[in-house]
């Protein structure tokens, strides 16, 4: 028989982690493995048909993606949809596929909303999702005794798909679910310095544990301004939500592992400011299969897609598409063995959910709602050389923090700052009120 996989991803624009130039080679490698393994879909042929999720400008589109999906559905009647990755593109497609009872598999669509499976029935996320970041942050807060207050700042940049809004939404909602904690959130425009000034005025009244989603440059600017304003001392900690680790990469940008460095005359101050900073990224898989997979992926991307893949955490996305597709094919194989058909979307999907799988990204666990348990890394600065290093990983499957370093985190005071100042945000603690009036008894 024939099994058709309908791909709805950006076909021209290569900048997305889920661009076809990146995911295509991963799909090729997965299908090559299916052919090579007699236990997977014996006697079946798997073919891919392509539709673009981008508009004429090469930008993810909530119009182009569902139109492409509808075309693919009527022309090819696919057994499964692969993608989209962009939130606004995936939303309408996911609603259509739910209505059609066709499984949708993606390693994108990380926003909180896709976890609502009555709306996005049969959507499986084999990649990371933002609510899972909230699980990590909640675990971190519990260990550090931060169970009262946090502040989340997110940047708005025209044309960036509101990545930071969705990231902070997932984090915010999950942290509030997991902990009985007050969380404030503030948006700022990256290109408007007056917004930064306003944030710095608000910060002291709203939090000491601060999460910031922004570009590396905006984060550095904020840290420099915070230092200037006296907010970078021992009382504050700033977490840069830099999930793909852009700020930690070399190349055209900052030197590897030194996110404060630009060579612009402000490096000394920036390094000092970054003493109060930690960086949160996805965890880079460290299993040997992943390194081997990346070699093949890069080779194939260059040979067949004329695309040069850079190193970095973005490669975990194509790798997750690869693993997700293999997991799907495994589920189809089992469904067929039990007398089902490739069009039995519900049955196939149920076989993928609440399941573990050993893939190129390592041990992969899809939870009972069809979302992958996600691993994260916490990076901290070595005060000796100013370089950032992974000090802690979060294992999403076991929900455990794992100490990667034998060195203590770099806390200026030697211990984590409290999440609420000693006297409260407005000096409201009566114990701190110096005007004690004696009473006559």
């Amino acid at each position: 028989g024939n099994l058709t996989v309908a791909v709805v991803l950006p076909l021209a624009n290569t900048s997305y982690p889920w661009s076809w130039a990146r995911v295509g080679p991963a799909v090729e490698l997965a299908l090559a493995q299916v052919k090579a393994r007699p236990d997977l879909l014996p006697g079946w042929t798997v073919r891919t048909v392509l539709g673009s999720s981008e508009n004429a400008l090469g930008v993810c589109s909530d119009t182009a993606a569902p139109l492409a999906a509808v075309d693919l559905k009527w022309e090819h009647n696919p057994a499964v949809f692969l993608g989209p990755g962009c939130v606004y593109a995936a939303a309408p497609v996911g609603r259509f596929t739910a209505h059609w009872r066709v499984p949708l598999l993606t390693a994108g669509a990380p926003a909180l909303g896709f976890g609502v499976k009555d709306e996005y029935a049969l959507t499986t996320r084999a990649g990371p999702s933002y609510a899972k970041l909230g699980d990590f942050v909640a675990a971190l807060h519990r260990r550090l005794g931060w169970e009262r207050q946090a502040l989340m700042l997110y940047a708005y940049r025209p044309g960036d798909e509101e990545h930071c809004f969705f990231l902070v939404e997932g984090l915010f909602m999950r942290v509030r679910d997991r902990l009985n904690i007050t969380v404030d959130h503030l948006e700022f425009a990256e290109d408007d310095l007056s917004h930064y000034t306003r944030l710095l005025r608000t910060m002291p009244r709203k939090g000491r544990v601060i999460y910031i989603c922004s570009s590396p440059d905006a984060f550095r600017t904020l840290m420099l301004l915070a230092l200037e304003a006296g907010l970078c001392g021992e009382d504050y900690v700033f977490f840069h939500l830099d999930i793909f680790g852009q700020s930690l990469q070399g190349g055209q940008g900052p030197a590897p592992r030194r996110p404060w460095e630009r060579g612009d005359g402000q490096d000394v101050s920036a390094r000092q400011a970054f003493q109060a900073a930690k960086i949160i990224t996805y965890k880079d898989p460290d299993n040997p299969e992943y390194l081997e997979f990346l070699k093949q992926l890069k080779h194939l991307a260059y040979e067949q897609f004329n695309f040069t893949m850079e190193d970095g955490l973005v490669n975990t996305i194509p790798a997750s598409f690869h693993d997700g597709l293999l997991l799907y094919i495994q589920a189809v194989t089992e469904t067929l063995a039990h007398g089902g058909t490739v069009t039995d979307g519900e049955n196939i999907t149920q076989r993928m959910w609440n399941r573990s799988f050993q893939g190129v990204t390592g041990y992969l666990k899809i939870d009972s709602s069809g979302d992958r348990e996600t691993d994260f890394s916490l990076w901290d600065m070595d005060p000796e050389n100013g370089a950032f290093r992974v000090v802690l990983n979060y294992n999403g499957t076991s929900q455990e923090l794992v100490a990667v370093s034998g060195r203590k985190l770099n806390w200026p005071l030697g211990y984590p700052p409290p999440d609420i100042p000693k006297c409260g945000f407005d000096n409201e603690d009566p114990a701190c009120n110096q005007d004690h009036l004696s009473t006559l008894e």
């Epitope: 000796e384 802690l392 923090l401």
Partner: antibody, heavy 120, light 107 residues
Framework: EVQLVESGGGLVQPGGSLRLSCAAS????????MSWVRQAPGKGLEWVST????????YYADSVKGRFTISNDNSKNTLYLQMNSLRAEDTAVYYC?????????????WGQGTLVTVSS | AIQMTQSPSSLSASVGDRVTITCRAS??????LGWYQQKPGKAPELLIY???RLPSGVPLRFSGSGSGTDFTLTISSLQPEDVATYYC?????????FGPGTKVDIK
């Protein structure tokens, strides 16, 4: 309740080997770095070795480097110290202790110790 | 390696006395210093971390201060159960190093 229980100590000849174990309970083992600290009879404390929870990073005192190997097994919540080419000056009570990299608590909990005697 | 020195090496004081032990590092270690109490025949116990922080359960008569190279452990009112040897530890950098210890007993 946090508990660390060392075992594996005993009498060994110079040049011989010994493997110490430390069974941990009452905390998430992999979330902490773990260390060995020793104390020669009538002397002060000496840090010996530390391993990260993931097992990826290890650190040794110069006096034991190349002879001792620290390791952990997170599935068993157990810390080990493989001691080779033992010398008389390695005679000591060996303690395991957990090291909290997150909160700055350094060696918060200690085991009761196990005595290693190196003598012919 | 960072050297740690402690003074005095031993002291005798009366119950209720204020006792001060100092620890000096051969180079700056910020506040990455802990104090440990070891009673005869027992394992050491953490008394102070990050130079001045008390773990829960440690009596408030113990306090720590200092930063950089010079540190102090103070027992505000010595009690009979405080008879022990006190060690400082730098965990700023590997190899970690302990001070030689200060033996405290009751006059």
């Amino acid at each position: 309740e946090v508990q660390l229980v060392e075992s594996g100590g005993g009498l060994v000849q110079p040049g011989g080997s010994l493997r110490l174990s430390c069974a941990a309970s009452g905390f998430t083992f992999s979330s902490y770095a773990m260390s060995w600290v020793r104390q020669a009879p009538g002397k002060g404390l000496e840090w010996v070795s530390t391993i990260s929870g993931s097992g990826t990073n290890t650190y040794y005192a110069d006096s034991v480097k190349g002879r001792f190997t620290i390791s952990n097994d997170n599935s068993k919540n157990t810390l080990y110290l493989q001691m080779n080419s033992l010398r008389a000056e390695d005679t000591a009570v060996y303690y395991c202790a957990n090291y909290d990299i997150l909160t700055g608590h350094s060696f918060e909990y200690w085991g009761q110790g196990t005595l290693v005697t190196v003598s012919s | 390696a960072i050297q740690m020195t402690q003074s005095p090496s031993s002291l005798s004081a009366s119950v209720g006395d204020r006792v001060t032990i100092t620890c000096r590092a051969s180079q700056g270690i910020r506040n990455d210093l802990g104090w440990y109490q070891q009673k005869p025949g027992k394992a050491p116990e953490l008394l102070i971390y990050a130079a001045s922080r008390l773990p829960s359960g440690v009596p408030l008569r113990f306090s720590g201060s200092g930063s950089g190279t010079d540190f102090t452990l103070t027992i505000s009112s010595l009690q009979p159960e405080d008879v022990a040897t006190y060690y400082c530890l730098q965990d700023y950098n590997y190899p970690f190093t302990f001070g030689p210890g200060t033996k405290v007993d009751i006059k």
